[in-house]
C-alpha cells in the first residue's frame, strides 16, 4: 500500500473497493479564441466566497475582489493572456468608487491597460465578460474602431491601439 | 482522457522524453502540468504548460533546467528530462486544469514508470 | 516559492466516524487549493477545487474548507471506500504560477 507522504486511509475490517470515476465536466470553452464561459459551479462558487474573500500574496482586496497591478508591459492581448493564465480577468470598472481605488493604487501616471475593447463584431466597446459598457457612467477618449483597446490614466478612459505596450491590471 | 508513454529504464546523467496524449479532445486552450510520485512516496508538481498562444510553461524551482515541457502537437504535450539520477525513479503522470474560475485538475492520466 | 504543510503525520478513526486534514500554506493562496485522492496504483481523483467547491460525483460527505493559508478537510460518515491517500495542492497566481502539494498525513479506518 502507498504510505509515506500521503494520507493514506485503511480499512482494517472489511473489503475496500479500489475503483476510481472519472467525470469530465466543466471543460474550458474558448469563444473566438478569447473569452471563456465560467461553468454555474465556480461561478456559485466563487460569489458565496465573496464575503469572506481572502486575496493571494500580492494582490489587493477590495470589495470582495482581488486586483494584481503589474510591473512590466505587454500588448493587450497579451496582458489579457496573462490575467487568463491566472484565472482572473483584465480590470473591470463598475463605478466611480472602484475607479477611484484603482487610481490611488496606481503609482504612476502613464496608462494602463483594462478589459474593455472595441469589437467590430458588435461595434461597441465591450468588457471582457462580454457586457456593453455603461456610457452613463464611463466616457472614453479616442476612436471607436477595430483594433482598439481601453486603458485608464488619471481616472479617465482612453482608446489606444491594441498593440501598444502598458502595464495592467488584472481582477478576479 | 489522458494517457502518458515513454517510461523505461534509464542509466544515470541519461535522458528520457516522455509523451501524454490525449483522447477525446484537443490542447486548445488548456493548462497541462506534469506530476510525478516516487515509489512509497507522495506527489510531488514539476511544471505546467499553456497550450494556448501563449504557450506559457512553469516549473517548481527544482526542476527548472533539467525539465522542459513542450507542446508538440494538438493533442501531445512532452516532458523530456535530462541529467537524470536515481532521485527521478518515479511514476510520472500528466494532469490537465478544467477549471475557470479556479484550478481543477480532473482528468489524469495512469501514469509511466521511469526508472533510473 | 510557496510550501504547502499537510497534517497530522498519522491520524485513526473509526468506520462511520470523522476524519479531519489539515493543509497550511506558507503564504496567503486565496482559495486556490484543491484535494485529491489517491488509492494505490491509481492516479490522483479531484475531490474538491477552490478550497470548498465539490467536484462532480464526489459524495457531500467530503466537506473543504478555509482561505488564505489556513485549510481543512473534512470525511464524515467515513466508509471503507474512502480508504485512500489525500492530499492537498495549492496554487499561486503571482509572476511565476507555482502548484505544490501537501505532504500529506497516514489515516488508519479502524
Known amino acids: 500500500l502507498l504510505v509515506s507522504q500521503g494520507v493514506l486511509l485503511k480499512c482494517q475490517k472489511g473489503s475496500c473497493s479500489n475503483a476510481t470515476q472519472y467525470e469530465d465536466t466543466g471543460d474550458l470553452k474558448v469563444n473566438n479564441g478569447t473569452r471563456r464561459n465560467i461553468s454555474n459551479k465556480d461561478l456559485c462558487a466563487s460569489r458565496s466566497a465573496d464575503q469572506t474573500v481572502l486575496c493571494q500574496s500580492e494582490w489587493l482586496k477590495y470589495q470582495g475582489k482581488c486586483y494584481w497591478f503589474s510591473n512590466e508591459m505587454k500588448s493587450w492581448s497579451d496582458s489579457y493572456v496573462y490575467c487568463l493564465e491566472r484565472k482572473s480577468h483584465l480590470l473591470i470598472i463598475h463605478d466611480q468608487l472602484e475607479m477611484a481605488f484603482i487610481q490611488k493604487n496606481l503609482r504612476q501616471l502613464n496608462y494602463v491597460w483594462i478589459g474593455l475593447n472595441f469589437t467590430s463584431l458588435k461595434m461597441t466597446w465591450t468588457w471582457v465578460d462580454g457586457s456593453p459598457i455603461d456610457s452613463k457612467i464611463f466616457f472614453i477618449k479616442g476612436p471607436a474602431k477595430e483594433n482598439s483597446c481601453a486603458a485608464i490614466k488619471e481616472s479617465k478612459i482612453f482608446s489606444e491601439t491594441c498593440s501598444s505596450v502598458f502595464k495592467w491590471i488584472c481582477q478576479y | 482522457s489522458l494517457e502518458e508513454s515513454g517510461g523505461d529504464l534509464v542509466q544515470p546523467e541519461g535522458s528520457l522524453t516522455l509523451t501524454c496524449t490525449a483522447s477525446?479532445?484537443?490542447?486548445?486552450?488548456?493548462?497541462m502540468c506534469w506530476v510525478r510520485q516516487a515509489p512509497g512516496k507522495g506527489l510531488e508538481w514539476i511544471g505546467c504548460?499553456?497550450?494556448?498562444?501563449?504557450?506559457?510553461t512553469y516549473y517548481a524551482s527544482w526542476a527548472k533546467g533539467r525539465f522542459t515541457i513542450t507542446k508538440t502537437s494538438s493533442t501531445t504535450v512532452t516532458l523530456q528530462m535530462t541529467s537524470l539520477t536515481a532521485a527521478d525513479t518515479a511514476t510520472y503522470f500528466c494532469?490537465?486544469?478544467?477549471?475557470?474560475?479556479?484550478?481543477?485538475?480532473?482528468?489524469w492520466g495512469p501514469g509511466t514508470l521511469v526508472t533510473v | 516559492d510557496v510550501v504547502m504543510t499537510q497534517t497530522p503525520a498519522s491520524v485513526e478513526a473509526a468506520v462511520g466516524g470523522t476524519v479531519t486534514i489539515k493543509c497550511q500554506a506558507s503564504?496567503?493562496?486565496?482559495?486556490?487549493l484543491s484535494w485529491y485522492q489517491q488509492k494505490p496504483g491509481q492516479p490522483p481523483k479531484l475531490l474538491i477545487y477552490?478550497?470548498?467547491t465539490l467536484e462532480s460525483g464526489v459524495p457531500s460527505r467530503f466537506k473543504g474548507s478555509g482561505s488564505g493559508t489556513e485549510f481543512t478537510l473534512t470525511i464524515s460518515d467515513l466508509e471503507c471506500a474512502d480508504a485512500a491517500t489525500y492530499y492537498c495542492?495549492?496554487?499561486?497566481?503571482?509572476?511565476?504560477?507555482?502548484?505544490?502539494f501537501g505532504g500529506g498525513t497516514e489515516v488508519v479506518v479502524k
Open positions: 494532469t490537465r486544469d478544467a477549471g475557470t474560475t479556479y484550478w481543477r485538475y480532473n482528468i
Open positions: 477525446g479532445f484537443f490542447f486548445s486552450s488548456y493548462c
Open positions: 504548460i499553456y497550450t494556448g498562444s501563449s504557450g506559457s
Open positions: 503564504q496567503s493562496i486565496g482559495s486556490d
Open positions: 477552490g478550497a470548498s
Open positions: 495542492q495549492g496554487t499561486t497566481r503571482s509572476s511565476s504560477i507555482y502548484w505544490p
